[in-house]
């Protein structure tokens, strides 16, 4: 059995502040089980911008429905984009564990924001 | 507001431990990595330990094995476990944000260290 | 480990001038390096990064420059709560995260 890919699509997206960010994520295969995270950076200091499994993010939405077993598109949505939220996002699988550990990486989404149009 | 508050420091021998708190509100703790920065009396500052939101820590040499970074996700407080402390450890212990950026962007006021036979 | 070395030591400078300092690094940092500034019994406070991004909130007095291992910070016009010790720290992706030994900008 092929091993899991985590595909981010889009090398880069640019949006207008105010507007929402649609950052585009799919994995090839339901094994091995655990979640997907996002987050803005690659280092140890990353921050982190979505968690399938708990915490607290108001402005990202799924667009899909993330909780199905079957699902494999984790593609997010961050609403009222501001200039502060430039950069680059990573889409993560991890490997159900205590605690969860990292499987794969996406290559990155680089969300860049225009000026809010006149 | 962003607000961190050391506590935990004090005065003790070389190679005895103590642990330092710091309690963070204003931001979704969870989210990010959070470190200790610290300053000996009159000296610059040296970064001392990181920890990222996954829990994966990082130290400085000059605290390896003997230091221990952790964080209660539930309780929003980091906390620095240090054993066998050394005179050259006397320093203003702060904790700090870290953003994606690997820039330290909230600082607290800081707790003083004092290791003295 | 990425050493930082800043210049001068001590800046005297009078209210209303131009200050400006510099930090070398002893290899490659790009971009990746930020200012902060302290002030006596307080705690760092960011002020640049990037090379040249201010913070929030920071006075548009405050620019850095410099990519590389030569990098810049100027103080357009000095006011009085801006005497204070400066570090500058790189900030590529992995730790361990160093700090320059700083430069006190005190009072002509």
């Known amino acids: 059995e092929e091993e899991l890919q985590v595909i981010q699509p889009d090398k880069s997206v640019s949006v207008a502040a105010g507007e929402s960010a649609i950052l585009h994520c799919t994995v090839t295969s339901l094994i091995p089980v655990g979640p997907i995270q996002w987050f803005r950076g690659a280092g140890p200091a990353r921050e982190l911008i979505y968690n399938q499994k708990e915490g607290h993010f108001p402005r990202v939405t799924t667009v899909s429905e993330s909780t199905k077993r079957e699902n494999m598109d984790f593609s997010i949505s961050i609403s009222n984009i501001t200039p502060a939220d430039a950069g680059t996002y990573y889409c993560v699988k991890f490997r159900k564990g205590s605690p969860d550990t990292e499987f794969k990486s996406g290559a990155g989404t680089e969300l860049s924001v225009r000026a809010k149009p006149s | 507001d962003v607000q961190l508050v050391e506590s935990g420091g004090g005065l003790v021998r070389p190679g005895e431990s103590l642990r330092l708190s710091c309690a963070a509100s204003g931001f979704t703790f969870t989210n990010y990595a959070v470190t200790w920065v610290r300053q000996a009396p009159g000296e610059g500052l040296e970064w001392v330990s990181l920890i990222s939101v996954t829990g994966t820590t990082y130290y400085a040499d000059s605290v390896k094995g003997r230091f221990t970074i952790s964080r209660d996700n539930s309780k929003s407080t980091l906390y620095l476990q240090m054993n066998g402390l050394r005179a050259e450890d006397t320093a203003v212990y702060y904790c700090?944000?870290?953003?994606?950026?690997?820039?330290?962007?909230?600082w607290g006021l800081g707790t003083l260290v004092t290791v003295s036979s | 480990e990425i050493v930082l070395t800043q210049s001068p030591g001590t800046l005297s400078v009078s209210p209303g001038e131009r200050a400006t300092f510099s930090c070398r690094a002893s290899q490659t940092v790009g971009s990746k390096l930020a200012w902060y500034q302290q002030k006596p019994g307080q705690a760092p406070r960011l002020l640049i990064y990037?090379?040249?991004t201010r913070a929030t909130g920071i006075p548009a007095r405050f620019s850095g420059s410099g990519s590389g291992t030569e990098f810049t910070l100027t103080i357009s016009s000095l006011q009085s709560e801006d005497f204070a010790v400066y570090y500058c720290q790189q900030h590529t992706d992995w730790p361990p995260y160093t700090f320059g030994g700083g430069t006190k900008v005190e009072i002509k």
């Open positions: 700090a944000k870290v953003t994606w950026k690997n820039v330290f962007d909230y």
């Open positions: 990037d090379a040249n």
